[in-house]
Interface confidence: low
Amino acid sequence: KETAFVEVVLFESSPSGDYTTYTTGLTGRFSRAGATLSAEGEIVQMHPLGLCNNNDEEDLYEYGWVGVVKLEQPELDPKPCLTVLGKAKRAVQRGATAVIFDVSENPEAIDQLNQGSEDPLKRPVVYVKGADAIKLMNIVNKQKVARARIQHRPPRQPTEYFDM
């Protein structure tokens, strides 16, 4: 289980039409459910139940987004429509280039993601928890445009890789 270095860039537009970028670095782990690869894309926050909807036409995003899913406590969803791995697969089928799970409320999900599938996803499936998860969700909940960049080595410079 390797460290995933995640950079998140938040875009704040000003009245003049310019925008300011704020870069935050955090770390997670690549799970065995997916590939250990770099990925980049606009963040799309997905509710775990939103991934239950099988009607893809209602929920299509441009190919190449990074899905962020905050998992609920298992008690709040005793009969989930999909396993955590199933949720990751559903996101990838809808065009996600990577999926990041906040497992703070559901640490059991880590074992589920690391059980090792015979057919792992070809895209990264990363999990974050604790302070890193808080940082990520603080940005995601701002409802602003944000991009995530996932790497399997520390970035050299904060903005080196971002494709604006």
């Epitope: 590939a35 250990t36 770099s38 299509l60 441009e62 190449g64 065009g95 070809k122």
Partner: antibody, heavy 116, light 108 residues
Framework: QVQLVQSGAEVKKPGASVKVSCKAS????????MHWVRQAPGQGLEWMGW????????NYAQKFQGRVTMTRDTSISTAYMELSRLRSEDTAVYYC?????????WGQGTLVTVSS | DIELTQPPSVSVSPGQTASITCSGD??????AHWYQQKPGQAPVLVIY???HRPSGIPERFSGSNSGNTATLTISGTQAEDEADYYC???????????FGGGTKLTVL
Amino acid sequence: QVQLVQSGAEVKKPGASVKVSCKASGYTFTSYHMHWVRQAPGQGLEWMGWINPYTGDTNYAQKFQGRVTMTRDTSISTAYMELSRLRSEDTAVYYCAREKVYMDIWGQGTLVTVSS
Amino acid sequence: DIELTQPPSVSVSPGQTASITCSGDSIPSKYAHWYQQKPGQAPVLVIYGKSHRPSGIPERFSGSNSGNTATLTISGTQAEDEADYYCAAWDLLGDGWVFGGGTKLTVL
């Protein structure tokens, strides 16, 4: 500068194999899928498969399964595509391409001619 | 399997607008990317996603989507835009790329 440099042109006889190399520079080789795409003379682009340079995992287009093998040597940041049991219709330019959500960087192409 | 269909050829006068379509039944067209290829050269990405231009690609290139058809539009077409254009889409089930048959753009 990010670039992919491919090996030179090859002439092969039917039934032989060819191995094309693609050397990456200017970025972390293991960070992105590498794809192989070919183009027969006067024809369109045809996707052959990809390799994850970090793990070595591969996925081949159904048409080429059993004949194509994609490998990599991370120590020299090079991807390889080997096509076996060559036939005349395999005459084409073979490209490697890095995928960063889309295929953004392409090699210059390697012409493989299959002729008896 | 996904199939992407393009017109084999499109002609346009210099300064006019050229439109090249790419249609596919089983794929959301918003996943389509566009490549330009000139004779003897490797393909070059000109539009990705909805209508994003990589750096170095002129503003006259744009992309749009409607239903299952993606369209590449070149406004104020110039002689140097004469080339073959390919749409490409990621096949989520086959886990690979599919290309359209290509469109030869002729600038009269």
